[in-house]
């Protein structure tokens, strides 16, 4: 494939990455799949600077990111190491709360209204953010 040198239409470029901000809601797994079909992934927050950028664009709205602990350890969807990476949890979070009455705990992370992170039931239909790196090989064949 060819290297992507600029962002697709309706995506926002920032620090050599492209971001797409949804305006509708999906369950975490559906949002994850949506991003993958766009040759991207749910946003992976690696710095305070990136956190502020995303926060500015999403506003005070619950929004999925690419972080989950559905198989035990917290994992970023692109393989970025959770343990050594940037974290911005709300105080007392993550708490794997069971009191929602929906069954099971809380396995998926989202931005809350103040931008800090919370774990929640993955089935909730929140907005989401896709991210793709500019310099990575595109899946599309090069133009002849």
């Amino acid at each position: 494939g060819s290297e992507r040198t600029c962002c697709p239409v309706n995506w926002v470029e920032h620090e050599r990455s492209c971001y797409w901000f949804s305006r509708s809601g999906k369950a975490w797994a559906d949002a994850d799949n949506y991003c993958r079909l766009e040759d991207a992934h749910l946003v992976v927050v690696t710095s305070w600077e990136e956190q502020k950028f995303v926060q500015h664009h999403i506003g005070p709205v619950n929004t999925w990111m690419g972080l989950h602990d559905q198989n035990g350890p917290w994992k970023w969807v692109d393989g970025t190491d959770y343990e050594t990476g940037f974290k911005n949890w709300r105080p007392e979070q993550p708490d794997d709360w069971y009191g929602h009455g929906l069954g099971g705990g809380e396995d998926c992370a989202h931005f809350t209204d103040d931008g800090r992170w919370n774990d929640d039931v993955c089935q909730r239909p929140y907005r989401w953010v896709c991210e793709t790196e500019l310099d990575k090989a595109s899946q599309e064949p090069p133009l002849l």
């Epitope: 035990g72 917290w74 069954g103 705990g105």
Partner: antibody, heavy 114, light 107 residues
Framework: EVQLVESGGGLVKPGGSLRLSCAAS????????MNWVRQAPGKGLEWVSS????????YYPDSVKGRFTISRDNAKNSLYLQMNSLRAEDTAVYYC???????WGQGTLVTVSS | DIQMTQSPSYLSASVGDRVTITCRAS??????LGWYQQKPGKAPKRLIY???SLQSGVPSRFSGSGSGTEFTLTISSLQPEDFATYYC?????????FGGGTKVEIK
């Protein structure tokens, strides 16, 4: 690498108390719910208690409620189980486990006998 | 409380056999179930999470299926190191509950 090491087990008389500890390493301790699970000699596994990452939520089965107290110290990466009013039926190997059992310690034996 | 009924309690099988263990929940727990293997004197080890997802590092001969109230752990071709006791665990709600266990022995 995730490591969980239990300690504090031993022989105690009925009605006595014991405090188990679990030292965790290799992961961001405060991000995870932690659990105690026990296994009586020759028997199956029994969940004993859970505590959320910041200690906001504590859970117990009826069999230990009011007698056992789970706690944690995130600054020390440590999980605890204070066991009071111990009974013979509390005799078991006690395991510390992370989240929903993706990682386990090696266990510590608690024997309640006169 | 949610009861987990596991069957059979004991199972005799030979190397190469296909082995199936079942757990039945007393109410719908969706896919909030894990399967664990335990060998004598050792801590349990998780094989399957969310009913059907294989834990990293676990051989592909292990598989999980089911949702709701009926769950199955299958070992497609039993190996010598698979002789152990297997447990299911529901984490749909507290109190968390284990199945009674299935001891897989050499025939």
């Amino acid at each position: 690498e995730v490591q969980l090491v239990e300690s504090g087990g031993g022989l105690v008389k009925p009605g006595g108390s014991l405090r188990l500890s679990c030292a965790a390493s290799g992961f961001t301790f405060s991000s995870y719910t932690m659990n105690w699970v026990r296994q009586a000699p020759g028997k199956g596994l029994e969940w004993v208690s859970s505590i959320s990452g910041s200690s906001s939520y504590l859970y117990y089965p009826d069999s230990v409620k009011g007698r056992f107290t789970i706690s944690r110290d995130n600054a020390k990466n440590s999980l605890y189980l204070q066991m009071n009013s111990l009974r013979a039926e509390d005799t078991a190997v006690y395991y510390c486990a992370r989240d929903r059992g993706s990682s386990w310690g090696q266990g510590t034996l608690v024997t309640v006998s006169s | 409380d949610i009861q987990m009924t596991q069957s059979p309690s004991y199972l005799s099988a030979s190397v190469g056999d296909r082995v199936t263990i079942t757990c039945r929940a007393s109410q719908d727990i969706r896919d909030n179930l894990g399967w664990y293997q335990q060998k004598p004197g050792k801590a349990p080890k998780r094989l399957i999470y969310t009913a059907y997802s294989l834990q990293s590092g676990v051989p592909s001969r292990f598989s999980g299926s089911g949702s709701g109230t009926e769950f199955t752990l299958t070992i497609s071709s039993l190996q010598p190191e698979d002789f152990a006791t297997y447990y299911c665990l529901q984490h749909y709600n507290y109190p968390l509950t284990f199945g009674g266990g299935t001891k897989v022995e050499i025939k």
